[in-house]
Amino acid sequence: RDCAEVFKSGHTTNGIYTLTFPNSTEEIKAYCDMEAGGGGWTIIQRREDGSVDFQRTWKEYKVGFGNPSGEYWLGNEFVSQLTNQQRYVLKIHLKDWEGNEAYSLYEHFYLSSEELNYRIHLKGLTGTAGKISSISQPGNDFSTKDGDNDKCICKCSQMLTGGWWFDACGPSNLNGMYYPQRQNTNKFNGIKWYYWKGSGYSLKATTMMIRPADF
């Protein structure tokens, strides 16, 4: 069950809820946004203050890390299982250091299983954070500092830091190094969403959230 189910069961307040893996009793804690755009959003990633190190191993990205009330990564395995059960949309909400906000909405999102390194699949981009997808299409395998699955001799995850669906190395990395204001420009390894802010701009805050398409 996900945050959409939690919402439909009558819990309409933002906060941390216990979710369960599909067809399993295994549990995971996630932050649910019950207000934005009708609510029911399961937050799968959040960056806001640099308090959590995102340069993590394959296994850490698999199971998740951080704190759902702050910066965290929900976990590739849970997201993969969830998004292969039914059709999900992905919304990526971004904030820059000048007070601007933007979003990218993908009408269909899922992650392959670990067998294919949690490869990302996306379709149908709309939103204000660029007309071209900053996540390379077709989607790539996930890479981490110890799991180099990109298409670059340079080992993108080590060079740019953080786990991400790197190409070679590609136009985005929302799990890069967190840089504070006035130190956030000309940073190749920062929190990047190229088709909104360009290659050297490191963002202030990001949220990745998913919800069933038929919500």
């Epitope: 394959w58 670990e114 067998e115 294919l116 390194n117 077709p138 790539n140 395998d141 110890d146 799991g147 180099d148 699955n149 990109d150 298409k151 670059c152 070679a168």
Partner: antibody
Framework: QVKLVESGGGVVQPGRSLRVSCAAS????????MHWVRQAPGKGLEWLAI????????YYSDSVKGRFTISRDNSKNTLYLQMNSLRAEDTAEYYC?????????????WGQGTLVTVSS | DIQMTQSPSSLSASIGDRVTITCRAT??????LAWFQQKPGKAPKSLIY???NLQSGVPSKFSGSGSGTDYTLTISSLQPEDFSTYYC?????????FGGGTKVEIK
């Protein structure tokens, strides 16, 4: 430098079993996925199996699924392929291959191979 | 399973020639393509990965290109040591599959 040395090949009768091994050196074995690939005499290359760096995940080609088992001992830097119910068509050179990462699926470095002949 | 079709299956060329080998997949493999060289009686050797990245130590006379389903290996100026069999391989998904090979012989 990366070194992969296969052993355990030989002549075996149809229906019998054989285990081939691969001793790895020159790199941190426990940080890399490992594969087995074979080549029948005068033929092309056929991928058989991968085992992830930690041994947790294993994937096989349909041609050997249920008959062959890939395993590893990270404490001994050794990769294994247990081959059961062998058939004449399993006759081939068996190569141990290092993955480029924990499981990128890219076949990075190859051993010199060990020949398995299945014949009565 | 993804099938890989290599062409030609063999070719004859002279020293200094530019040689091109093609590989076609039965579906889009998103540049998850590698090339290998195998000399008689020897193990294959990795040349190129992710369509165009040269493996460490591989000379720049080798180059790779392509996208989607169609890929190419080019040897810019053939040398005696290049007479070998070349294989393409997709690693987009399991099972990993190889092309049938291209034998490059001396004319």
């Amino acid at each position: 430098q990366v070194k992969l040395v296969e052993s355990g090949g030989g002549v075996v009768q149809p229906g019998r079993s054989l285990r081939v091994s691969c001793a790895a050196s020159g790199f941190t074995f426990s940080s890399y996925g490992m594969h087995w690939v074979r080549q029948a005499p005068g033929k092309g290359l056929e991928w058989l199996a991968i085992i992830w760096y930690d041994g947790d995940n294993k994937y096989y080609s349909d041609s050997v699924k249920g008959r062959f088992t890939i395993s590893r001992d990270n404490s001994k830097n050794t990769l294994y392929l247990q081959m059961n119910s062998l058939r004449a068509e399993d006759t081939a050179e068996y190569y141990c291959v290092r993955d480029a990462s924990i499981a990128s699926r890219f076949l990075d470095y190859w051993g010199q191979g060990t020949l398995v002949t299945v014949s009565s | 399973d993804i099938q890989m079709t290599q062409s030609p299956s063999s070719l004859s060329a002279s020293i200094g020639d530019r040689v091109t080998i093609t590989c076609r997949a039965t579906q889009d493999i998103n540049n998850y393509l590698a090339w290998f060289q195998q000399k008689p009686g020897k193990a294959p050797k990795s040349l190129i990965y992710a369509t165009s990245n040269l493996q460490s130590g591989v000379p720049s006379k080798f180059s790779g290109s392509g996208s989607g389903t169609d890929y190419t290996l080019t040897i810019s100026s053939l040398q005696p040591e290049d007479f070998s069999t070349y294989y393409c391989q997709q690693y987009h998904s399991y099972p990993l599959t190889f092309g049938g090979g291209t034998k490059v012989e001396i004319k």
